[in-house]
Amino acid sequence: KRFHDVLGNERPSAYMREHNQLNGWSSDENDWNEKLYPVWKRGDMRWKNSWKGGRVQAVLTSDSPALVGSNITFAVNLIFPRCQKEDANGNIVYEKNCRNEAGLSADPYVYNWTAWSEDSDGENGTGQSHHNVFPDGKPFPHHPGWRRWNFIYVFHTLGQYFQKLGRCSVRVSVNTANVTLGPQLMEVTVYRRHGRAYVPIAQVKDVYVVTDQIPVFVTMFQKNDRNSSDETFLKDLPIMFDVLIHDPSHFLNYSTINYKWSFGDNTGLFVSTNHTVNHTYVLNGTFSLNLTVKAAAPGPCPPPPPPPRPSKPTPSLATTLKSYDSNTPGPAGDNPLELSRIPDENCQINRYGHFQATITIVEGILEVNIIQMTDVLMPVPWPESSLIDFVVTCQGSIPTEVCTIISDPTCEITQNTVCSPVDVDEMCLLTVRRTFNGSGTYCVNLTLGDDTSLALTSTLISVPDRDPASPLRMAN
């Protein structure tokens, strides 16, 4: 059997196989050692007994999407049946005091591979016995502690495979310079040691994406905005836009990145090299926000002027260029890429990313201030608590709700939170009455809210002993 017979039905075209060469990966036309690594079809009854105590689940994730030329990292995590875990030696053990369907186990081990390897590898001083090999016959690399690695992971994509020895979690990084743009499929098959052979325990697949567009995301933050995720913001208060570029492999670390903003409110274009920008909308309505990100990224070099034709064709750089083209394969000249020649073959190419959002601007509470605090005299001679009136003004829209959070003087330990609807006139002047149990210094956070906004003000207040002569003070 060959690798492609074992590892999946996705058969890339000859063009894809030729032009998606992954560094360090091998062709899936290679032979698979079925004796050491048995192959089971889906639904084969043997899967049921491939692992003691249940099925192992493999979870495959990636940091896709990847900008072409950058590295994409795949991670596989094995999830064992309940009460099982991998110990420091790579053995699979039962968790202490954990009860599964079978009850508590007397044997601490699910799989004691340390004992197995000591038994089976004694025949050869090098430890390189015929079974310590991958499915294609390549020997296991002898990293320190490699004997504690009891799982064999076979990654398969684009007609190529990569083999890795590991523990219950592995990571593999692939450079995407030669990968065709668009969605691609990664398949992983996991085997475990079983005496002098291996047993399949899990298969998993996931789609990843390679793109020539810089993956861009914009977070928006505005003071007093009640819900930052609804793309509704307040008039007359600055919105902070922060551009996040998805670049987990730091491919663009040394690139100059330009940000070109159009806020959709006829304020023109704003160009910046800073990933954050503030903008204030002064009118209500719906606006179309557009951002274009431009980065000079490492890229393929344009082919040099053609030399005298050799007798035998050699692969040209055109094949490398193809990998950047999201259209169907064509000659290099079809590729509308901006290329700039830089000495010693480190060429750069301008990559672009786009972000568009429709944002709604509405009236909101812009500001809130406590302008006066008054101790309310009670009819009882020595009341247990103090009633305090906070006279509050606000600017902007009419609040519908007031909340007070009363806490300790550090403003960290909340003692009491009270929210209630308020009726406020157009002048936006209101009095909030709150009870304070006992004298002392309190931190008072007072927020006024409406449907779209939440404005906060804070003060420290010193509540005196209930001696009528002692006045109420703002502690700050």
């Epitope: 519908t400 709700e401 009726d423 009095t431 409406d450």
Partner: antibody
Framework: EVQLLESGGGLVQPGGSLRLSCAAS????????MSWVRQAPGKGLEWVSS????????YYADSVKGRFTISRDNSKNTLYLQMNSLRAEDTAVYYC?????????WGQGTLVTVSS | QSVLTQPPSASGTPGQRVTISCSGS????????VSWYQQLPGTAPKLLIY???QRPSGVPDRFSGSKSGTSASLAISGLRSEDEADYYC???????????FGGGTKLTVL
């Protein structure tokens, strides 16, 4: 002069629906929160629901949550109460009132009778 | 069973001073304004006191409100026969997220 005029009350069978209206005049309706309060025959006052001036915030008594819906049309200066799945215990005079932290003006009420 | 507790009835003779109490908790009376409503027989309720002790214009100063801790009181001095009505206290309850009323006090002028 502030005026609140309720309408839409009447006799309805259990499980039935009714929509009450409250026409407001004499003040800038869109600047005020509005509420519904009811009073069963011979009983005390029971708050039913309140809505903010813009209609974005709504509160309901537990006894009507999921069955009643408060709404408003500021262009028509009208407050509504849509009552579904009515029960015998919803029988009451329904008052429309201005504001929600206190009720400073009240309508004359409309009687809703739920009976088979 | 009302969240705010009022005596079911109270009485007094003309000219006398009568007090009606209203008891609650820190989530309503303790931290929110109390209002008092008067309901004359066969009519809609009318606001008598708001913000614990404030009188709307047109309400005689014979009516006064006060609050201490989690209790509130309505005092009517110089009682008149036209004061015979049901009186309700009310406040927002921040725990229930609801406006709550007392059960009402029937005032009889003897």
């Amino acid at each position: 002069e502030v005026q609140l005029l309720e309408s839409g009350g009447g006799l309805v069978q259990p499980g039935g629906s009714l929509r009450l209206s409250c026409a407001a005049s004499g003040f800038t309706f869109s600047n005020y929160a509005m509420s519904w309060v009811r009073q069963a025959p011979g009983k005390g006052l029971e708050w039913v629901s309140s809505i903010s001036h813009s209609g974005g915030s709504k509160y309901y008594a537990d006894s009507v949550k999921g069955r009643f819906t408060i709404s408003r049309d500021n262009s028509k200066n009208t407050l509504y109460l849509q009552m579904n799945s009515l029960r015998a215990e919803d029988t009451a005079v329904y008052y429309c009132a201005r504001k929600w932290s206190t009720f400073d003006y009240w309508g004359q009420g409309t009687l809703v009778t739920v009976s088979s | 069973q009302s969240v705010l507790t009022q005596p079911p009835s109270a009485s007094g003779t003309p000219g006398q001073r009568v007090t009606i109490s209203c008891s609650g908790s820190s989530s309503n009376i303790g931290n929110n304004y109390v209002s008092w409503y008067q309901q004359l027989p066969g009519t809609a309720p009318k606001l008598l006191i708001y913000a614990d002790s404030q009188r709307p214009s047109g309400v005689p100063d014979r009516f006064s409100g006060s609050k201490s801790g989690t209790s509130a009181s309505l005092a009517i001095s110089g009682l008149r026969s036209e004061d015979e009505a049901d009186y309700y206290c009310g406040a927002w309850d921040s725990s229930l997220n609801a406006y709550v009323f007392g059960g009402g006090t029937k005032l009889t002028v003897l």
